[in-house]
């Protein structure tokens, strides 16, 4: 489900613009957090800080928690480490497209997309290609806008993420997220 009919233009949580703004805030915060945990100075990630409201802060915490869990999945880390970043755009869009290729959308896959973007950003930092950072963030938001926006609107905006991961079994969902990303990377490697 991409964009269904005309997108609402108001300022509510399901307006196109609000979803994109919140998505950009969450992505930026998530990537900055992942980079900070590596311990390295990353002035390239010192993007304009935007004040977060209480709802966005909760969402950011939720994403951090899932990110930490995914970091401890060794199979996933091995797969990501093996990604050839000579053509990062092709890798990103192939993996992203594959994650949603069956037409089934859920918050787990949205988080997997953010996580994969963060790993590509960290690779860019390690390989001293800082100009790629904003580019990768841009690709992620482009993909979100063109493929996921309508679905996020149908979930009532980003707050749907909290209810999805707010269950006692959120670790189980995180295992599913890792599986989605691992499967997509496997397919990409076979195609490559």
């Amino acid at each position: 489900m991409d964009g269904s009919g005309e997108q609402p233009r108001g300022g509510g949580p399901t307006s196109s613009e609000q979803i994109m703004k919140t998505g950009a805030l969450l992505l930026q915060g998530f990537i900055q957090d992942r980079a900070g945990r590596m311990g390295g100075e990353a002035p390239e990630l010192a993007l304009d800080p935007v004040p977060q409201d209480a709802s966005t802060k909760k969402l950011s915490e939720c994403l951090k928690r899932i990110g930490d869990e995914l970091d401890s999945n060794m199979e996933l880390q091995r797969m990501i480490a093996a990604v050839d970043t000579d053509s990062p755009r092709e890798v990103f869009f192939r993996v992203a497209a594959d994650m949603f290729s069956d037409g089934n959308f859920n918050w787990g896959r949205v988080v997997a997309l953010f996580y994969f973007a963060s790993k590509l950003v960290l690779k860019a930092l390690c390989t001293k290609v800082p100009e790629l950072i904003r580019t990768i963030m841009g690709w992620t938001l482009d993909f979100l806008r063109e493929r996921l926006l309508g679905w996020i609107q149908d979930q009532g905006g980003w707050d749907g993420l909290l209810s999805y991961f707010g269950t006692p079994t959120w670790q189980t969902v995180t295992i599913f997220v890792a599986g989605v990303l691992t499967a997509s990377l496997t397919i990409w490697k076979k195609m490559g």
Partner: antibody, heavy 119, light 109 residues
Framework: EVQLVESGGGLVQPGGSLRLSCAAS????????MHWVRQAPGKGLEWVAS????????SYADSVKGRFTISADTSKNTAYLQMNSLRAEDTAVYYC???FGYGWAFDYWGQGTLVTVSS | DIQMTQSPSSLSASVGDRVTITCRAS??????VAWYQQKPGKAPKLLIY???SLYSGVPSRFSGSRSGTDFTLTISSLQPEDFATYYC???????????FGQGTKVEIK
Amino acid sequence: EVQLVESGGGLVQPGGSLRLSCAASGFNIYYSSMHWVRQAPGKGLEWVASISPYSSYTSYADSVKGRFTISADTSKNTAYLQMNSLRAEDTAVYYCARSFGYGWAFDYWGQGTLVTVSS
Amino acid sequence: DIQMTQSPSSLSASVGDRVTITCRASQSVSSAVAWYQQKPGKAPKLLIYSASSLYSGVPSRFSGSRSGTDFTLTISSLQPEDFATYYCQQSAGGYPLITFGQGTKVEIK
């Protein structure tokens, strides 16, 4: 109401330059992607260039790479196409279009501006 | 780059006919395929996005489908206002390397 209005077309000699503008209204271009598509007289549509103003990420068709530059000024809500080293084969109607939420389909288009490259 | 081969390049049909236009991708693509209608001297208009989703305000006689690398636009019952040129467009080869099909002119028989 969403609107895209192109301007800047005209007659230019081979090797010359021209700058096209696309003024957007009814939406904010910041989180959109903006595109230029051209159509030579009696021919089909050809994608020229795209920009995502949020990240300033740009992409170009091979036929214009190194000669054309797409840019955006979010404060003016306007996208631009700077065309240098123009050739006769660049003669076309140039359309500005946006994509926003429809799988990279272009949901709104401008009326087009004619660029004629001739001596 | 991915090429989109559109067929036929032109066709003649009568009002009420069922019309089918096909675009074949040169390699496997995702469903990021759109269809447009263009009339002389006018900008194209979006009909179908994501291979099979009908854009807002487009009559339901237009539909899109996908089978592997083949994408099809179908007009179930051709109306007088449907005589125009139709284009497919893909952006699946690593956005935004976008390509259009060559176009199909639908003329009155």
